[in-house]
């Protein structure tokens, strides 16, 4: 039962234009272009989008018109390759244009940059934003899509349309409010934070598909959907997994029109069949399309059916285990994963996948043994340590978080991870450790039954950020090893890393620890980042420094910043007191 239309269309571009409507078509083409050509000015992209849209309209009017039968990759690739400054701006990416489809699109995909050299987005004054919004609402919203898409080249395009809709609603409401800032700023903060989280989650899905293949993604999807829809039958979950895999494969592959169209079809199918999927979908299914799709993606787990039978009966005690496994290995393992996941909403998806991998490895070994049943009879006993490891880790870290609070917990992780992989760039270590530290406030408040899925699956998303950033400029074999060996064992791999004894400490550079009065005007978050940057650098200079030594230096540093920010002549204070601080810190750390 495939939900996607299989009928051939003379013109793919006309088909998608009609399905999606002009507004969504234009928005998705803009996102696609901005995600490919991340450095191009906004105006250039708008021009390209308008040209593609006009062409699509001619195809809607006559599907047999010239070039209307071309694939979307061909049409879009040809359009991107008309950009005059391609070689100057993008260097070797221009070589993609010499290739034919599908190699050309693959080439563009390979040149997507997870960390583009773009200025930080600075939020203008509220009045300035509201004026811009009222002056030209369409351009204002397009600019939002463009700025997010070019900074997040794997952002889930149909979900970005949903963010843009909320962005528009926020300005529509708040620009008429008495206190515009009080109304608008919290909404924008929420959209920014949710947007970053959404981008990171999607980046993991794309990494899963691109680095580990469709089978890995499908396994993830079986586990997650089985937790979410435990009343659905295996055939239903399998069907949803197949369709969801198609949607994400398309989006990760830059096929954004097909992706958005198929996602809408999938939401429609789910809502038409909610009786056999989940009792929690009713509210979602009453919403408009973009909200509906988002709501379904975030829907809470349905209640587990009563009277679920023992898993051991079919997967351990049965004499037919090896026969069933041999007949259809992936289907049998899929059923195992489905049955285990629907019984364990309290487990992380990655833990469930580790259990399934252990089960698979055991069957591979035992089904070739003289007495298979005797060999695999104790397989469930092998699960115990795998379950206990994340449980214990989460317990310990939540205790540490509750004791320290978020900022100091982040600092503890900064020190821990800098010692594990000191070769990684300081900005990456700061960004990743800060995000790892957010697991505390995000997950430790939950009861035991929700902690592990919250924490470990979130950590998978954050560690993927480390992996994709490191892949761009690899500097550590240990990071490469943890990132590439096993998707589901990334977190245990990083957790198991000890201090890198081979690391040669960084030469001391006073400039790194020189601060100026501008730190006083920074937001609390920015000030924390400055201090955390200094902490990473300290550890890189002195990897063997003790917690106590580092704490003492950081306390002195905090006091120094506070003192100088209160001084009349701030800059002089920073210059003079800064020298003293550096000298004292060197002495304290024996540098």
């Amino acid at each position: 039962r495939g939900v996607f239309r299989r009928d051939a269309h003379k013109s793919e571009v006309a088909h998608r234009f009609k399905d999606l409507g002009e507004e969504n078509f234009k928005a998705l083409v803009l996102i696609a272009f901005a995600q490919y050509l991340q450095q191009c000015p906004f105006e250039d992209h708008v021009k390209l989008v308008n040209e593609v849209t006009e062409f699509a309209k001619t195809c809607v009017a006559d599907e047999s018109a010239e070039n209307c039968d071309k694939s979307l990759h061909t049409l879009f690739g040809d359009k991107l390759c008309t950009v005059a400054t391609l070689r100057e701006t993008y260097g070797e990416m221009a070589d993609c244009c010499a290739k034919q489809e599908p190699e050309r699109n693959e080439c563009f995909l390979q040149h997507k940059d997870d960390n583009p050299n773009l200025p930080r987005l600075v939020r203008p004054e509220v009045d300035v934003m509201c004026t811009a919004f009222h002056d030209n609402e369409e351009t204002f919203l397009k600019k939002y899509l463009y700025e997010i898409a070019r900074r997040h080249p794997y952002f889930y395009a149909p979900e970005l349309l949903f963010f843009a809709k909320r962005y528009k609603a926020a300005f529509t409401e708040c620009c008429q409010a008495a206190d515009k800032a009080a109304c608008l700023l919290p909404k924008l903060d929420e959209l920014r934070d949710e947007g970053k989280a959404s981008s990171a989650k999607q980046r993991l899905k794309c990494a899963s598909l691109q680095k580990f293949g469709e089978r890995a993604f499908k396994a993830w999807a079986v586990a997650r959907l089985s937790q979410r829809f435990p009343k659905a039958e295996f055939a239903e979950v399998s069907k949803l997994v197949t369709d969801l895999t198609k949607v994400h494969t398309e989006c990760c592959h830059g096929d954004l029109l097909e992706c958005a169209d198929d996602r809408a079809d999938l939401a429609k199918y789910i809502c038409e069949n909610q009786d056999s999927i989940s009792s929690k979908l009713k509210e979602c299914c009453e919403k408009p399309l973009l909200e509906k799709s988002h709501c379904i993606a975030e829907v809470e787990n349905d209640e587990m059916p009563a009277d679920l039978p023992s898993l051991a009966a079919d997967f351990v005690e049965s004499k037919d285990v090896c026969k069933n496994y041999a007949e259809a290995k992936d289907v049998f393992l899929g059923m195992f994963l489905y049955e285990y996941a629907r019984r364990h909403p309290d487990y992380s998806v990655v833990l469930l996948l580790r259990l399934a991998k252990t089960y698979e490895t055991t069957l591979e070994k035992c089904c070739a043994a003289a007495d298979p049943h005797e060999c695999y009879a104790k397989v469930f006993d092998e699960f115990k340590p795998l379950v206990e490891e994340p449980q214990n880790l989460i317990k310990q870290n939540c205790e540490l978080f509750e004791q320290l609070g978020e900022y100091k917990f982040q600092n503890a992780l900064l020190v821990r991870y800098t010692k594990k992989v000191p070769q990684v760039s300081t900005p990456t270590l700061v960004e990743v450790s800060r995000n790892l530290g957010k697991v505390g406030s995000k997950c430790c408040k939950h009861p035991e039954a929700k902690r592990m899925p919250c924490a470990e699956d979130y950590l998978s998303v954050v560690l993927n950020q480390l992996c994709v950033l490191h892949e761009k400029t690899p500097v550590s074999d240990r990071v490469t090893k943890c990132c590439t060996e096993s998707l589901v064992n990334r977190r245990p791999c990083f957790s198991a890393l000890e201090v890198d004894e081979t690391y040669v400490p960084k030469e001391f550079n006073a400039e790194t620890f020189t601060f100026h009065a501008d730190i006083c005007t920074l937001s609390e978050k920015e000030r924390q980042i400055k201090k955390q940057t200094a902490l990473v650098e300290l550890v890189k200079h002195k990897p063997k420094a003790t917690k106590e030594q580092l704490k003492a230096v950081m306390d002195d540093f905090a006091a120094f910043v506070e003192k100088c920010c209160k001084a009349d002549d701030k800059e002089t204070c920073f210059a003079e007191e800064g020298k003293k601080l550096v000298a004292a810190s060197q002495a304290a750390l024996g540098l």
Partner: antibody, heavy 121, light 111 residues
Framework: EVQLVESGGGLVQPGGSLRLSCAAS????????MGWVRQAPGKGLEYIGI???????YYASWAKGRFTISRDNSKNTVYLQMNSLRAEDTATYFC???????????????WGQGTLVTVSS | DIQMTQSPSSLSASVGDRVTITCQSS????????LSWYQQKPGQPPKLLIY???DLASGVPSRFSGSGSGTDFTLTISSLQPEDFATYYC???????????FGGGTKLTVL
């Protein structure tokens, strides 16, 4: 009272289809594999197949393709769908509860009274 | 297909007699012991007497016993009672659940 009750039998023409039901009461079907066995008039017992607690199905070679066993744990019922029926399928059809959960041990310790299926034109 | 051969196919005996019925399979049963015995009376469903070759099912009198391993099995009734006159079937479980099979039956009648 713990019991199994078959229903859905009757007269059917050759080539026709029939769906038999087996309703359990006094216990949950989700804890055991459930099998179907038939007995032609005056003849011996013949194994048709079984469905495990997790829904895995196993059929005698002669039954594969024509007969399908399914279960609905929420209704505490097991079904036997029979297609392309022939005169030689005329028999009393029993459902039975196996001692095992995940496979057929051949040890059925609870049986229904059976339902008669007659295939005739 | 796996064959289960029961002998004799019919047997006459008197109350108090010791009776033995044998069952032979064309292949070894699973774990060498997955063999059951049933009793069936006219108009009734079968009743499980013995499972795993020698284990007595719940509520079955101790005059019934089973033995054997691999391919050869025996059901023994140590002292026939009037209610024991019925048809007896063996059933074997094999390495695949698809291969479960019943013997042809042994009809035990009053001499």
């Amino acid at each position: 009272e713990v019991q199994l009750v078959e229903s859905g039998g009757g007269l059917v023409q050759p080539g026709g289809s029939l769906r038999l039901s087996c309703a359990a009461s006094g216990f949950s079907l989700s804890s055991n594999a459930m099998g179907w066995v038939r007995q032609a008039p005056g003849k011996g017992l013949e194994y048709i197949g079984i469905i495990s607690v997790g829904g895995f199905t196993y059929y005698a070679s002669w039954a594969k393709g024509r007969f399908t066993i399914s279960r609905d744990n929420s209704k505490n019922t097991v079904y036997l769908q029979m297609n392309s029926l022939r005169a030689e399928d005329t028999a009393t059809y029993f459902c039975a509860r196996d001692r095992h959960g995940g496979d057929s041990s051949g040890a059925f310790y609870l049986w229904g009274q059976g339902t008669l299926v007659t295939v005739s034109s | 297909d796996i064959q289960m051969t029961q002998s004799p196919s019919s047997l006459s005996a008197s109350v108090g007699d010791r009776v033995t019925i044998t069952c032979q399979s064309s292949e070894s049963v699973y774990s060498n012991n997955q063999l059951s015995w049933y009793q069936q009376k006219p108009g009734q469903p079968p009743k499980l007497l013995i499972y795993d070759a020698s284990d007595l099912a719940s509520g079955v009198p101790s005059r019934f016993s089973g033995s054997g391993s691999g391919t050869d099995f025996t059901l023994t009734i140590s002292s026939l009672q009037p209610e024991d006159f019925a048809t007896y079937y063996c059933a074997g479980g094999f390495s695949s659940s698809s291969d479960t099979a019943f013997g042809g039956g042994t009809k035990l009648t009053v001499l």
